[in-house]
Interface confidence: medium
Amino acid sequence: DTHKSEVAHRFKDLGEEHFKGLVLVAFSQYLQQCPFEEHVKLVNEVTEFAKTCVADESAENCDKSLHTLFGDKLCTVATLRETYGEMADCCAKQEPERNECFLQHKDDNPNLPPLVRPEVDVMCTAFHDNEATFLKKYLYEVARRHPYFYAPELLFFAARYKAAFAECCQAADKAACLLPKLDELRDEGKASSAKQRLKCASLQKFGDRAFKAWAVARLSQKFPKAEFAEVSKLVTDLTKVHTECCHGDLLECADDRADLAKYMCENQDSISSKLKECCDKPLLEKSHCLAEVENDEMPADLPSLAADYVESKDVCKNYAEAKDVFLGMFLYEYARRHPDYSVMLLLRLAKAYEATLEKCCAAADPHECYAKVFDEFQPLVEEPQNLVKQNCELFEQLGEYKFQNALLVRYTKKVPQVSTPTLVEVSRNLGKVGAKCCKLPEAKRMPCAEDYLSVVLNRLCVLHEKTPVSEKVTKCCTESLVNRRPCFSALELDEAYVPKAFNAETFTFHADMCTLSEKEKQVKKQTALVELVKHKPKATKEQLKGVMDNFAAFVEKCCKADDKEACFAEEGPKFVAASQAALA
């Protein structure tokens, strides 16, 4: 359905509040260094223009595409060249190349200060003084740090942020009410950002076929009672939504997401019995709820898969007639029977099945050739099962911090060329899989763990793509989306790596260490651990443990001293010398 004015269409569909919020997110995700006031000004100008188009769709420029309108507006920023350098060259291009150029310049690791949370009274005063500005600032600060954050979901986070302040700034103990809510929003927000980043990477690096395969598997697990045709329709619509959001088309994305939520709620009977409680909620909450909905119960009478996909003499005929549909049906049937498998495992099985059919359907006796195809799945299934079992045992034995350290050592030995901050960030997040997944019942462990690891490893891939330093990382990241995790798991100690020269400065600490939060102290220690491994990649676990224990004791001693700085100055060199001796 075509509209004379796309901007008027979206303004009317979304309403002013969501329209303004989404435009602010879009601009903040593109121009991540621009000051807040500049973005607010641009958003207000776009909004006023949209209102003129709503009043008269034939008015001047109202027929232009959203990319043209938004790109023109972004290109009016006076400091574009000096702030963004070559990104300013995008403005010399025509659409659609200009938008593609802006997308390519999105920075996953922008040089922005960490968001420091001031005292609760500061935040409550700012909230009461100007609620609208306060919430816009939240959208801006999150969007510029997370340039692929799922925009309609960010509006939902902002609504929760607003609700938290509205409730807690009235409370007797504001901090006790507010801080846990803000911690929860921060942690959920980071997780949401990382999950969306994987969806965008999947679409952008591996194409919509890869994303659709992921969606078929995941939706079939969630909605095992739905027919294949119903799942296919949802997959097509969901792919459109995420393609739009990942492409910076945030108004279209939010609009289509709302349409998808409406469709699902109108067709609950043919999708899932679990949708009912979501469908009674307001739009943003409803869409979030539908995205997070638990798996429906599997139908009791599902027949064996072997009949249609192994025993049937028509397998090659059906495959040849419509390869993607046949493989899609296989994936749907397998996934709806296996909520206990990770999506990535299901996709590996579908890939293995496809490879077998490609080979066997060209053979003299195809049926004889593919008769044992399901037996070939066994090692593929056992590999993640064993991995989860071993790592959960290690997590339970060590606890989260020491489990993270074990992963830090493991990954630094695999890819020592990767920057220390990236290794620390990624390994800390890999280590969080323990607390997140190991407490779950057996049937939920693998999907939780492996699909979470895929999200974390995608962060490594995204950061590494910006500054590539390791052929191994490039290989694991680019060869196969579904085999990324097994590829990283299979990496061994990099024998070709030349150990980093010892730098005493790296292991020099000061009294400011004592005022750090527990998390910041851990990061400092883990940074030192990575540097140690880079210096001595063949150090044993025992050697590294000895050094880290000495480090903890040294820091504890100096933080208890009367003259902390003097203690660090005196004890530091002793610690460095002892560490070098222990690792010699």
Epitope: F36, L112, P113, L115, V116, P118, E119, D121, V122, M123, T125, A126, D129, N130, T133, K137, E141, D512, T515
Partner: nanobody, 115 residues
Framework: QVQLVESGGGSVQPGGSLRLSCAAS??????MGWFRQAPGKQRESVAA???????KYADSVKGRFTISRDNGKNTVYLQMNSLKSEDTAVYYC???????????WGRGTQVSVSS
């Protein structure tokens, strides 16, 4: 409305000193930061002081500028020594520390350094 009032700016020769003050209406806020905006440039962080008194400075002012505060007077200061021509800008303060501002900007105070 919280109001932030900056003062202490002026014209000075290279190598000179100024002390800027910023008063926050109502109460003492933490953390606080000084920012500046030169003509045709974006506003940038200059110095910040945390809840615990820890400080942070832009590389270009390290060793020359000192941020401090007087909790009793709800005031934060920026002592600027060895001023250079590139320090010429309008200086603003805000609540929120390094790179983050929580309240509407005040009018700022102009600092001009030239011979």
């Amino acid at each position: 409305q919280v109001q932030l009032v900056e003062s202490g700016g002026g014209s000075v020769q290279p190598g000179g000193s100024l002390r800027l003050s910023c008063a926050a209406s109502g109460r003492n806020f933490n953390p606080m930061g000084w920012f500046r905006q030169a003509p045709g440039k974006q506003r940038e962080s200059v110095a910040a002081i945390g809840t615990d008194g820890s400080t942070k400075y832009a590389d270009s002012v390290k060793g020359r500028f000192t941020i401090s505060r007087d909790n009793g007077k709800n005031t934060v200061y920026l002592q600027m020594n060895s001023l250079k021509s590139e320090d010429t800008a309008v200086y603003y303060c805000n609540v929120g520390g390094w790179g983050i501002s929580w309240f509407p900007w005040g009018r700022g105070t102009q600092v001009s350094v030239s011979s």
